[in-house]
């Protein structure tokens, strides 16, 4: 029986050009984590395997860094990075657990403040 739960950072926002850490945590189970896949809308970002270590997809190599831990760091964020991200935990003997994070990439604070204090 699968007793574990995935805790994620939930809905998060970050500034364009900045970086963000995507983090999931599997709790309430003694199952062994054999692999974690990080995906973005039907696209593989990275895999962390207990035996093989990290694999970062070639198209994301310049902007994705492994860690901390089983998490993933996204760098040089663009507005196109806005969307859903999934952590898929492959465990033994439980099976697969999936967590979801929604990232919104915002224009920089300077642009925001400029708009906020405009005289109507």
């Amino acid at each position: 029986m699968m007793t574990g739960t995935i805790e994620t950072t939930g809905n998060i926002s970050a500034e364009k050009g900045g970086s963000i850490i995507l983090q999931c945590h599997l709790s309430s189970t003694t199952a062994q984590v054999t692999q974690v896949n990080w995906e973005q809308q039907d696209q593989l970002l990275a895999i962390c395997n207990a035996d093989l270590g990290w694999h970062i997809s070639p198209s994301f190599k310049d902007r994705v860094a492994p860690g901390p831990g089983l998490g993933l760091t996204l760098q040089s964020l663009t507005v196109n990075d806005t969307g859903e991200y999934f952590c898929i935990y492959h465990t033994y003997p439980d099976g697969t657990y999936t967590g979801r994070i929604f990232l919104e990439v915002l224009e920089s604070s300077v642009a925001e403040h400029g708009a906020r204090f405009q005289i109507p």
Epitope: Q32, T34, Q35, E39, D42, Q43, L44, I47, N49, A50, D51, L52, H55, S57, S59, H90, Y92, P93
Partner: antibody, heavy 118, light 107 residues
Framework: EVQLLESGGGLVQPGGSLRLSCAAS????????MSWVRQAPGKGLEWVAS????????YYADSVKGRFTISRDNSKNTLYLQMNSLRAEDTAVYYC???????????WGQGTLVTVSS | DIQMTQSPSSLSASVGDRVTITCRAS??????LNWYQQKPGKAPKLLIY???SLQSGVPSRFSGSGSGTDFTLTISSLQPEDFATYYC?????????FGGGTKVEIK
């Protein structure tokens, strides 16, 4: 350099048995999932069986379930396929393959031919 | 089982041509789609994995795209050594299944 070298193929009568071996070198064998894939003469590729690295879990195609057994000996860096109750339709070149992260096959052996005929 | 349908089953092309091969899955397989090249009497060789990632050492004229059920392998400028048979394969679930293959021949 990654190398996968199959052996054990040959001519066998219907109902007979064979054991294929795949000697792996050039990488940490125990860290990788491994598979057997076959190809009948003039036909396409057909997955036969897989075995995971950390758990030893095994998976089989319906066409071979109950007749074939995949196993590994990490101390010998060797993958095996025990084939029993062989049928004419099992005639094929059998490839040993490495499966990193369980998602793709990045290295294949040169293949060993199994012919089932009376 | 997930069925993989490749088209065309064969095609004739000339050196320098742009070649496109398609693969359709009978259900969504996300990005779990790989492409292999096989030459007569040889083992298959990995070209593209996870739908769009180019395997190390493979020329950049090969590219892959798609997600869900529809995928494409493109050879931007066909070279003499590219005449071979190409297979797609899904690794979303067992049984792992391959497409029927596309034979690329010289026109």
């Amino acid at each position: 350099e990654v190398q996968l070298l199959e052996s054990g193929g040959g001519l066998v009568q219907p109902g007979g048995s064979l054991r294929l071996s795949c000697a792996a070198s050039g990488f940490t064998f125990s860290s990788y999932a491994m598979s057997w894939v076959r190809q009948a003469p003039g036909k396409g590729l057909e997955w036969v069986a897989s075995i995971k690295s950390s758990t030893g879990y095994t998976y089989y195609a319906d066409s071979v379930k109950g007749r074939f057994t995949i196993s590994r000996d990490n101390s010998k860096n060797t993958l095996y396929l025990q084939m029993n109750s062989l049928r004419a339709e099992d005639t094929a070149v059998y490839y040993c393959a490495r499966v990193p992260y369980g998602v793709w096959i990045d290295y294949w052996g040169q293949g060993t031919l199994v012919t089932v005929s009376s | 089982d997930i069925q993989m349908t490749q088209s065309p089953s064969s095609l004739s092309a000339s050196v320098g041509d742009r070649v496109t091969i398609t693969c359709r899955a009978s259900q969504s397989i996300s990005y779990y789609l790989n492409w292999y090249q096989q030459k007569p009497g040889k083992a298959p060789k990995l070209l593209i994995y996870a739908a769009s990632s180019l395997q190390s050492g493979v020329p950049s004229r090969f590219s892959g795209s798609g997600s869900g059920t529809d995928f494409t392998l493109t050879i931007s400028s066909l070279q003499p050594e590219d005449f071979a048979t190409y297979y797609c394969q899904q690794s979303y679930s067992t049984p792992l299944t391959f497409g029927g293959g596309t034979k690329v021949e010289i026109k």
